[in-house]
């Protein structure tokens, strides 16, 4: 924007802020039971884990920050079934971790070609 | 729990994960216009800024991670009014920044003081 009217340092600070808000994988706290769609009589300790999920702003209001690639991270958690019939078991739980994000538009019917460099 | 059944290192990793998921102020991307409730003919560049907002997990499902203290951070942004009658103006915009968080019941009898100016 009309850079001549404002000092370069101020513009640099604004630009850095904008870069930091861009759509990208961000560390997020997710609830394991909701994530896995487990029944209410199965729960985990700890109930939440940290993974990366897409978030942030896009250059257009109509675009949505969405994942383009996902890996699955294995987290060691205690799985507890109620009523408690045995010692809580330490189980590996696979949770989706977004590794790539893109600002995507809504598509009415037909898919479109998305090229991710 | 039952630490005797599991090696200390595994329990330590699980505990560290749990600590990191706890309810606390987390850096978040917020859309300025939505935040300020501005009309569509006023917009900002960049449209989003980074601030801290309460997020994370609570020990009980009935609790919600909410802010208990708030400061207001001033961000230098371009405010643009449409139709554009002058050069976009560089303005200080005050955005709420959560400095304290607590796991609170969904409908507390004695509400916590949440400051949202």
């Amino acid at each position: 924007f009309a850079a001549t009217f404002y000092d370069i340092e101020t513009l640099k600070v604004i630009d850095e802020e904008w870069q930091r808000t861009q759509c990208s994988p961000r560390e997020t706290c997710v609830e394991v039971a909701s994530e896995l769609g487990k029944s209410t009589n199965t729960f985990f300790k700890p109930p939440c884990v940290n993974v990366f999920r897409c978030g942030g702003c896009c250059n257009e209001e109509s675009l949505i920050c969405m994942n383009t690639s996902t890996s699955y991270i294995s987290k060691q958690l205690f799985e507890i079934s109620v009523p408690l019939t045995s010692v809580p078991e330490l189980v590996p739980v696979k949770v989706a971790n977004h590794t790539g994000c893109k600002c995507l538009p809504t598509a009415p019917r037909h898919p479109y070609s998305i090229i991710r460099r | 729990f039952a630490a005797t059944f599991y090696d200390i290192e595994t329990l330590k990793v699980i505990d560290e994960e749990w600590q990191r998921t706890q309810c606390s102020p987390r850096e978040t991307c917020v859309e300025v216009a939505s935040e300020l409730g501005k009309s569509t003919n006023t917009f900002f560049k960049p449209p989003c800024v980074n601030v801290f907002r309460c997020g994370g997990c609570c020990n009980e499902e009935s609790l919600i991670c909410m802010n208990t203290s708030t400061s207001y951070i001033s961000k230098q942004l371009f405010e643009i009014s449409v139709p554009l009658t002058s050069v976009p103006e560089l303005v200080p915009v005050k955005v709420a920044n959560h400095t304290g968080c607590k796991c609170l019941p969904t409908a507390p009898r004695h509400p916590y003081s949440i400051i949202r100016r």
Partner: antibody, heavy 118, light 112 residues
Framework: QVQLVQSGAEVKQPGASVKVSCKAS????????MYWVRQAPGQGLEWMGY????????TYNQRFKGRVTMTTDTSTSTAYMKLRSLRSDDTAVYYC???????????WGRGALVTVAS | DIVMTQTPLSSPVTLGQPASISCRSS???????????LHWLQQRPGQPPRLLIY???NRFSGVPDRFSGSGAGTDFTLRISRVEAEDVGVYYC?????????FGQGTKLEIK
């Protein structure tokens, strides 16, 4: 003020490629998506796709079936559109247009006429 | 793809008189975020297009207030309260709710 300066007119043979440039000035180049739109002589507007200059992400109109490539050079604030395997019906004025946060194509280049003839 | 249909295709108008152009989309242009990304462009002879109205009813920078936009869902209208000689050209509606972005076929505004 915002300006989009496009490269000049070109005449190409069928089967060849063309690369149109669009140099932006007067705003933060990485903060806005750049659209490419073409207009055949006496016809309406056709959207080809866009590029996000911040990260190089592109979304193309399926109609161009892998013939189009959009790129940017952030060091010179320039956007490029390359169209391959040209046919006579690709004869058109090719426009670059900046898109505002609210979705309207708010600033346009003057267009680059590409004529495909043998 | 979303088909944008404009009517009329040609509109002969007397100077100083009002004019209106209709645009209908084959599907709703209401985005999942609640906004409607329907825009109007003007293309004068020999010129690139120029943004007039964005998001249904917001006039862009430097656009005279005789231009106004309205509508919702699938039906939209551009109105010119008093046509001036400089308004001659082709008017396009465009949508940026869905991909691919699409345009109406254009309405030619001419003076009687």
């Amino acid at each position: 003020q915002v300006q989009l300066v496009q490269s000049g007119a070109e005449v190409k043979q069928p089967g060849a490629s063309v690369k149109v440039s669009c140099k932006a000035s007067g705003y933060t180049f990485t903060g806005y998506n750049m659209y490419w739109v073409r207009q055949a002589p006496g016809q309406g507007l056709e959207w080809m796709g866009y590029i996000d200059p911040y990260n190089g992400d592109t979304t193309y109109n399926q109609r161009f079936k892998g013939r189009v490539t959009m790129t940017t050079d952030t060091s010179t604030s320039t956007a490029y559109m390359k169209l391959r395997s040209l046919r006579s019906d690709d004869t058109a004025v090719y426009y670059c247009a900046r898109t505002s946060y609210y979705g309207g194509m708010d600033y346009w280049g003057r267009g680059a006429l590409v004529t495909v003839a043998s | 793809d979303i088909v944008m249909t404009q009517t009329p295709l040609s509109s002969p108008v007397t100077l100083g008189q009002p004019a209106s152009i209709s645009c209908r989309s084959s599907q709703s242009l209401v985005h999942s975020n609640g906004n409607t990304y329907l825009h109007w462009l003007q293309q004068r002879p020999g010129q690139p297009p120029r943004l007039l109205i964005y998001k249904v009813s917001n006039r862009f920078s430097g656009v005279p207030d005789r231009f106004s936009g309205s509508g919702a869902g699938t039906d939209f209208t551009l109105r010119i309260s008093r046509v001036e000689a400089e308004d001659v050209g082709v008017y396009y509606c465009s949508q940026s709710t869905h991909v691919p972005r699409t345009f109406g076929q254009g309405t030619k505004l001419e003076i009687k």
